[in-house]
């Protein structure tokens, strides 16, 4: 018997992937479990095997098609089940009707690059990956810059309240190594959350010009 809590959480990346995590306090690590997806208006069913990610949680990705294909819409409902093997049969452990566009988590932004760097400022651009065309411009971003001697957690968050895939970082210190990350979130969806942070982009500001003797 499981004495603690259990939780089944899934997110749709807006294109062709539903990522799920099943956690259960006190469950056996070697239990074989899977997630089954049954859409209300599609011909396909999909299953993925839950694999351990920590002592009491398992994760898997339901791959619905090619990465950039639009497999679900705002009107779709997908019934998701967690099934675990008990002896010779599969037992339902959790169930929910999943509204994909109410539970969004996009892929991390990609292709970060320094467009222009000076002594005190740096212009950086990026791209969003596998994001639905349904969003049009209804996205927001958060960015953070890692300064020497600090941690990512200490870095102040810069918020871009529109679909702006670039930023100009100001008031930087000359000849200094920095790292930069960005994440994205659609405005749509009651349970929508931020994407993972992008891979960090390392850059260095230019040294200050040497003063001339007078």
């Amino acid at each position: 018997a499981v004495n603690g809590t259990s939780q089944f959480t899934c997110f749709y990346n807006s294109r062709a992937n539903i990522s799920c995590v099943w956690s259960q306090d006190g469950a056996l690590q070697d239990t074989s479990c899977q997630v089954h997806a049954w859409p209300d208006r599609r011909r396909w069913n999909q299953t993925c095997e839950l694999l351990p990610v920590s002592q009491a949680s398992w994760a898997c990705n339901l791959i619905l098609g090619a990465p950039d294909s639009q497999k679900l819409t705002t009107v779709d409902i997908v019934t998701l089940r967690v099934l675990c093997r008990e002896g010779v049969r599969w037992r339902v452990m959790a169930i929910q009707d999943f509204k994909p566009f109410e539970n969004l988590r996009l892929m991390a932004p990609i292709s970060l690059q320094v467009v222009h760097v000076e002594t005190h400022r740096c212009n950086i651009s990026w791209e969003i990956s596998q994001a639905s065309h349904y969003f049009e411009r209804h996205l927001e971003f958060e960015a953070r810059t890692l300064s020497p001697g600090h941690t990512w957690e200490e870095a102040p968050l810069l918020t871009l309240k529109q679909k702006q895939e670039w930023i100009c970082l100001e008031t930087l210190t000359p000849d200094t190594q920095y790292e930069f990350q960005v994440r994205v979130k659609p405005l749509q969806g009651e349970f929508t959350t931020w994407s993972p942070w992008s891979q960090p982009l390392a850059f260095r500001t230019k040294p200050a010009a040497l003063g001339k003797d007078t």
Epitope: V82, I95, Q96, D97
Partner: nanobody, 125 residues
Amino acid sequence: QVQLQESGGGLVQAGGSLRLSCAASGRTFSNYVMAWFRQAPGKEREFVGAITQTGRGTFYADSVEGRFTISRINDKNTVYLQMNSLKPEDTAVYYCSAPRSGRAGTRNQMDYEYWGQGTQVTVSS
């Protein structure tokens, strides 16, 4: 906040049927998985079955599978438990419950946030 109120319990003979109702008020009913649990005298509360937000999906405890059926009518903010082929061991207080909005239904009572007061079902032999 969701308020739940069960009704329909009573005394029935073994082999008989009974239909319990659970009326919900408060938040949007159709956002919630709904479940039934029961507690017999001197025993722990046990999972009976659950139904998804639209009613597309259900699952049941082994002890009631094939005899009990959960259904819901979202327009009426009501979930039902149809109990057939009742046995004396089905005697218990039956509770309607729901997890937080958007959460999945599980077999674990710890995962449920909202509970009704319960309705007594007694099956005589």
